[in-house]
Amino acid sequence: LSLKGSQTLTVCPGSVQPLSSQTLRASSSAGTDPQLLLYRVVRGPQLGRLFHAQQDSTGEALVNFTQAEVYAGNILYEHEMPPEPFWEAHDTLELQLSSPPARDVAATLAVAVSFEAACPQHPSHLWKNKGLWVPEGQRARITVAALDASNLLASVPSPQRSEHDVLFQVTQFPSRGQLLVSEEPLHAGQPHFLQSQLAAGQLVYAHGGGGTQQDGFHFRAHLQGPAGASVAGPQTSEAFAITVRDVNERPPQPQASVPLRLTRGSRAPISRAQLSVVDPDSAPGEIEYEVQRAPHNGFLSLVGGGLGPVTRFTQADVDSGRLAFVANGSSVAGIFQLSMSDGASPPLPMSLAVDILPSAIEVQLRAPLEVPQALGRSSLSQQQLRVVSDREEPEAAYRLIQGPQYGHLLVGGRPTSAFSQFQIDQGEVVFAFTNFSSSHDHFRVLALARGVNASAVVNVTVRALLHVWAGGPWPQGATLRLDPTVLDAGELANRTGSVPRFRLLEGPRHGRVVRVPRARTEPGGSQLVEQFTQQDLEDGRLGLEVGRPEGRAPGPAGDSLTLELWAQGVPPAVASLDFATEPYNAARPYSVALLSVPEAARTEAGKPESSTPTGEPGPMASSPEPAVAKGGFLSFLEANMFS
């Protein structure tokens, strides 16, 4: 592989220049097709970018291209104008040429960006030479926004720059006006002004009136050294164009419009925020608007102009507050299509948007936020927060006005005090417990939608990670064993690496939870329990005495236990064990281990069917002597003896 061509590219400032075969020309001894001569950009340009003419010029920087694409003029270098002026800048591209099986060739393409170059698309050699617009018979300041030779100064090393200036020598004066520096006219005897005077805003063009023909001046600009000495350096001879406008030649410029917002059936004035133009050569009364198309949600009216709709009005009507929009009962937004003219220029299209606000909004809270206990956090959804008015409000915004006590609201995993409906719908708003001392929390938000607000309280509860028995009824008067078949927090234990604890908050209404002795030899009867652990459940140390509802005929009943479940590093949770009870039926297989059965049933105890269906021996053989209130092992013996 060999590389020919100058490997230098000269680019005009701010322009796009194609790479050509003069710049970059690869060939191979095998006469390889240019499509197969591949360049890879190892290091891209610093002062601009390389892109392909056929591809999206805003896309990613070019990484690969072929010699064929260079030949076709499709590989372009674009120089990006920096904020600071310069005279000449240099850029480099490091390329690697490859075409297997030949060895790769490294190449450097040097790019020179210079104001020295003759540039058809940028005829001026100055940083700015934009010309000036001036109203007929008036004066206008020529500032560095229009004429600026700072780039000539940029050719001087920065330490010496402050001692230099640029001298503009007027070689042809304006024919229809005059130039003034610090209010002193320039003339053949004093034809100079400086870049520093231009930068200080001291150069003025005064038009002499008598027509709107073009004007301008020619000048030569070159560097001037300390104490006015002439120095070698860049210079240029150019013309500065001055366009003289008729006093009412400038067309009105429409300004950005804010939508009018009002509630259904109401009336609102239209102000300059909705309709305004900039037109220095027209009075507000001369700027006329005409309604081309009106929306269905109301009409425009003029104060003092009758009650009906108006189709023509002026900027003066707007400025004085006489123009109003009258909304009908519709809740849909609408747009007025208007045309606007100052009478001298062609009409310009404009629009006025009208947004009908809800008279009230409602924050719908369909369900409290349930936080899984082992996770300690949960995403909010439309179930928790959704705003409706006369329609759904997908663009509602929320602000926290009373934060949660035991946690934080987060967006993107970061604490926040404001969020949007959109973020809720994406699952991005998360409530996380940070203080594990409560099983519930709440926070208050202010919802804002289309200018109307409403507040709401979101309740947060923790969903216990607990497997609860959900089988058939339990026998009244019996004591059944509470074990992991009834209550099991084993998964919570695994997830937290701790032994979960239970606290009895409420219930049962008929009966009680007791700790049963380990063996017959253990002294004491069963003890009332208010707290226990998962280990207690696994050890079979707990019993539930199922009572009979008092003062009513025997029959099925319902009861429940309310428990608070605690574990390390997670919030506590309240859980309920709901169960049905029925009079004891010795013939019925109960799906829990019974530690004792009702006294009256014990006459049947010797019969085979008195064994519990779980394969546990009946109470005569297995009960660890619970001293239950209504009948126990001793009273069972006593009853049998006397019978």
């Epitope: 995403s379 987060l410 926040t416 699952g427 997830r495």
Partner: antibody, heavy 112, light 107 residues
């Protein structure tokens, strides 16, 4: 402090599926909020691929959605990225991150 | 998608200089913005989250400000270890998007 470590093949053939795993140590993946995959093409900026959340929800960058799957294995404290039908344009350094902490990145080259 | 545009794309500065990098979002993102630092061959490191909150272990010479669409990262006194590329990232809307980066080089 949480540490993340990417693992997986450094070379994948075009049209095949890129598979990477991120192992989280010093914390549980049910403790973080968003477990992300991000990639960086050579010499370029960062592109978010997608995430899996603490509660197992996914969100993916629409530009890659049809080809991406992010899953997790809580028992191994890992989450994974699968990117199907890869092309040379998928050559990049792939990072796993929870945004507070990032893995050191793994370069995946797609080439035949 | 929300486009994030950083400026400048690169800058040269000296140790001790005050450096400011700006990031502009194509639409409002409230304060949902993070800043990262990345050194060659390394993973990005979180510097600032939620526009102005300093991540743990990050020196106090780094600060962030802004809201809506315009955001700024400031390094009050540039240190030798601060020469790196800096990225902003929004997390207001999915997909989460990054700026194209600002390279801070030694003058």
């Amino acid at each position: 402090q949480v540490q993340l470590q990417e693992s997986g093949p450094g070379l994948v053939k075009p049209s095949q599926t890129l598979s990477l795993t991120c192992t989280v140590s010093g914390g549980s993946i049910t403790d973080g909020y968003y477990w992300n995959w991000i990639r960086q093409h050579p010499g370029k900026g960062l592109e978010w691929i997608g995430y899996i959340t603490f509660d197992g929800r996914n969100n993916y960058n629409p530009s890659l959605k049809s080809r991406v799957t992010i899953s997790r294995d809580t028992s191994k404290n890992q989450f994974s990225l699968k990117l199907s039908s890869v092309t040379a344009a998928d050559t990049a350094v792939y990072y796993c991150a929870d945004f507070d902490y990032w893995g050191q990145g793994t370069l995946v080259t797609v080439s035949s | 998608d929300i486009q994030m545009t950083q400026s400048p794309s690169s800058l040269s500065a000296s140790v001790g200089d005050r450096v400011t990098i700006t990031c502009r979002a194509s639409r409002g993102i409230r304060e949902y913005l993070n800043w990262y630092q990345q050194k060659p061959g390394k993973a990005p490191k979180l510097l600032i989250y939620y526009t102005g909150s300093l991540h743990s272990g990050v020196p106090s010479r780094f600060s962030g400000s802004g809201s809506g669409t315009d955001f700024t990262l400031t390094i009050s006194s540039l240190q030798p270890e601060d020469f790196a590329t800096y990225y902003c990232q929004q997390y207001s809307e999915l997909p989460w998007t990054f700026g194209q980066g600002t390279k801070v080089e030694i003058k």
